[in-house]
Interface confidence: low
């Protein structure tokens, strides 16, 4: 599923991401835009053999199990395929664990490079939330 900007903002808000660990909703929508272009089925292979999955590009080395990544930790205790669902519950729940891990949203390279320090509220402007 490819979400619309405001559609995703509303879904993320319903799942409790607004101001989760101090990060406003705009941060999460911005991260999703530059990680996956709002596509729940986005996948990208990394040079270390791991794969990033879903709307927030969650990595199989640490967070989910795809049966393909040597030394996977599966810290979210989920199959990576769950992160490709049009229902973003699994991605949100895992993202909450990731953002609580010490580095905050710096765990997402796209957020660090494209969203951090910018006007992230623009990503929810005009949305009826």
């Amino acid at each position: 599923k490819v979400f619309g900007r405001c559609e995703l903002a509303a879904a993320m808000k319903r799942h409790g991401l607004d101001n989760y660990r101090g990060y406003s909703l705009g941060n999460w929508v911005c991260a999703a835009k530059f990680e996956s272009n709002f596509n729940t089925q986005a996948t990208n292979r990394n040079t270390d053999g791991s794969t990033d999955y879903g709307i927030l590009q969650i990595n199989s080395r640490w967070w989910c199990n795809d049966g393909r990544t040597p030394g996977s930790r599966n810290l979210c205790n989920i199959p990576c395929s769950a992160l490709l669902s049009s229902d973003i519950t699994a991605s949100v729940n895992c993202a909450k664990k990731i953002v609580s891990d010490g580095n905050g949203m710096n765990a997402w390279v796209a957020w660090r490079n494209r969203c951090k320090g910018t006007d992230v509220q623009a990503w929810i402007r005009g949305c009826r939330l």
Epitope: Q41, A42, T43, G49, G67, R68, P70, S81, L84
Partner: antibody, heavy 116, light 107 residues
């Protein structure tokens, strides 16, 4: 139960192209990688590459880049592999398999014969 | 690419014998090694995943061991239905690679 049903045997002329299909049933097609494997007598098993049907992401063995092209139709739960510019070296049995790192589920194989 | 070398190429045994098949990787692959059985005109069948975990429905006489570069598939008391080709496969890196196979035949 999980099943992968491949298309039937093909006899093709050198230089032609062929498209092999692999219809999946019994699981969520979009969320598992479909792998393609080549087997020639005396050459063992060779991994050609893989496709994740839900996203269309593909990864190819360098050896088969330009030779194989993967596609998938999620409406019919079918994966396809097209082989182009066929030569006698492409004569083989081609398998699709569901990828979990290991391959627990395999198609029955499609025999391709390239002959003038 | 990771090369997998299987030995011996052919193993001639009598039903009831116990046998060991070897698979050696060109570099360490941890436990990311899987074993398959293939009979003539059939698709490969998964026997062992991740070096030592039996696949669903596989008889207990099949077992796997090893880690790093050296792996073994053991068959305790071979039965006539066990004859055929055996392949190992690694999932530690891309491209996925297979061993050249060991043929288990009746003596």
């Amino acid at each position: 139960q999980v099943q992968l049903q491949e298309s039937g045997a093909e006899v093709m002329k050198p230089g032609a192209s062929v498209k092999i299909s692999c219809k999946a049933t019994g699981y969520t097609f979009t969320t598992y990688w479909i792998e393609w494997v080549k087997q020639r007598p005396g050459h063992g098993l060779e991994w050609i590459g893989e496709i994740l049907p839900g996203s269309g992401s593909t990864y190819y063995n360098e050896k088969f880049k330009g030779k194989a092209t993967f596609t998938a139709d999620t409406s019919s739960n079918t994966a396809y592999m097209q082989l182009s510019s066929l030569t006698s070296e492409d004569s083989a049995v081609y398998y699709c398999a569901r990828g979990d790192g290991f391959y627990c589920y395999w198609g029955q194989g499609t025999t391709l014969t390239v002959s003038s | 690419d990771i090369e997998l070398t299987q030995s011996p190429a052919t193993l001639s045994v009598t039903p009831g014998d116990s046998v060991s098949l070897s698979c050696r990787a060109s570099q360490s692959i941890s436990n990311n090694l899987h074993w398959y059985q293939q009979k003539p005109h059939e698709s490969p069948r998964l026997l062992i995943k991740y070096a030592s975990q039996s696949a669903s429905g596989i008889p207990s006489r099949f077992s796997g061991s090893g880690s790093g570069t050296d792996f073994t598939l053991s068959i305790n008391s071979v039965e006539t239905e066990d004859f055929g080709m055996y392949f190992c496969q690694q999932s530690n890196s891309w491209p996925r690679t297979f061993g050249g196979g060991t043929k288990l035949e009746i003596k």
